[in-house]
Amino acid sequence: LQDLCSNCPAGTFCDNNRSQICSPCPPNSFSSAGGQRTCDICRQCKGVFKTRKECSSTSNAECDCISGYHCLGAECSMCEQDCKQGQELTKKGCKDCCFGTFNDQKRGICRPWTNCSLDGKSVLVNGTKERDVVCGPSPADLSPGASSATPPAPAREPGHSPQ
């Protein structure tokens, strides 16, 4: 009897009520592997979720987040609010990055500016809330009296896409 069920392909289930005949998965359900005794209910993308890929008889639906939110967790199990570049999400909402830290994305945390001296380099372009520093030549490579840091480019939204 087990052998009969193993013949049931993906998109079907082994129907015990019908002498282990392979029956198609009912609407809004799927089986991604063969030999299944039941079909799984399709994921529904509602609320802050939007459908990225429709459910089929052999694969689950895939969700994305609506505009203003980004995915978290495996298979986009959660949606988290976007912040602006130069901010991070806290329990109290979006907060500006503290001095010495930056976030160049709409998600994630404010990170410390890179310590150029770790690599024996100097700061070529100063950091901002939205941008990391750009490291430049080692101080020894700079001509005497030359300024090591140039001011950041004029502030603008570089538009990092949330991932």
Epitope: R111, L118, D119, D132, V134, P158, G159, S161
Partner: antibody, heavy 119, light 107 residues
Framework: QVQLVQSGAEVKKPGASVKVSCKAS????????INWVKQAPGQGLEWIGN????????NYNQKFKDKATITADKSTSTAYMELSSLRSEDTAVYYC????????????WGQGTTVTVSS | DIQMTQSPSSLSASVGDRVTITCRPS??????LNWYQQKPDKTVKLLIY???RLRSGVPSRFSGSGSGTDFTFTISSLQPEDIATYFC?????????FGQGTKLEIK
């Protein structure tokens, strides 16, 4: 000196997975982003994604989101990229790179790992 | 995604020639433009970062200029060891993108 040494060439069948490694040495592994870049035969370079090993924060190119999984092991200073459900179009040289003191350019490149997908 | 239009796709020049490659991003990337050299053995090296900054140890015959949406890479006097493919790359906006490359050959 700063070095990224990648694992050897792989030949895989369609539908299989492969995990490429990138071992870092000569610097503090947790302080720099590691990026992965694809170069298909006769083609240009494509950024796949990156990881900040300190907290394993990742970014992905949307194009590779369902294809690549990037991880890092701080204890061995090694970054990994796993490619799943391989197809012939995944045949390429894959490079790991380290940024130049910030994440906007890459001054250290691994030697590349050739992944061939063939039935 | 930002598209990087690099030209020419290939060029042939003589030793001592001045060689120029251009890169045009589809949107303003400030100065976050880098140039890489890929040798025939597939090894890749950063030559220029942040538009015009020569990486330490790179010969001064290599230079870069531009800003916004128009960038230029120049080899002032081509040497035999410069046979390679050159790529531009923007580091302004995720996903970071590369130009299609310029294959440089010696006449």
């Amino acid at each position: 000196q700063v070095q990224l040494v990648q694992s050897g060439a792989e030949v895989k069948k369609p539908g299989a997975s492969v995990k490429v490694s990138c071992k870092a040495s000569g610097y503090t592994f947790t302080s720099y982003w590691i990026n992965w870049v694809k170069q298909a035969p006769g083609q240009g370079l494509e950024w796949i994604g990156n990881i900040y090993p300190s907290d394993s924060y990742t970014n992905y190119n949307q194009k590779f989101k369902d294809k690549a999984t990037i991880t890092a092991d701080k204890s061995t200073s090694t970054a990994y990229m796993e490619l799943s459900s391989l197809r012939s179009e995944d045949t390429a040289v894959y490079y790991c790179t380290r940024d130049y003191g910030s994440s906007y350019s890459y001054n250290v490149w691994g030697q590349g790992t050739t992944v061939t997908v063939s039935s | 995604d930002i598209q990087m239009t690099q030209s020419p796709s290939s060029l042939s020049a003589s030793v001592g020639d001045r060689v120029t490659i251009t890169c045009r991003p589809s949107q303003d990337i400030s100065n976050y433009l880098n140039w890489y050299q890929q040798k025939p053995d597939k090894t890749v090296k950063l030559l220029i970062y942040y538009t015009s900054r020569l990486r330490s140890g790179v010969p001064s015959r290599f230079s870069g200029s531009g800003s916004g949406t128009d960038f230029t890479f120049t080899i002032s006097s081509l040497q035999p060891e410069d046979i390679a493919t050159y790529f531009c790359q923007q580091g302004d906006t995720l996903p970071y993108t590369f130009g299609q490359g310029t294959k440089l050959e010696i006449k």
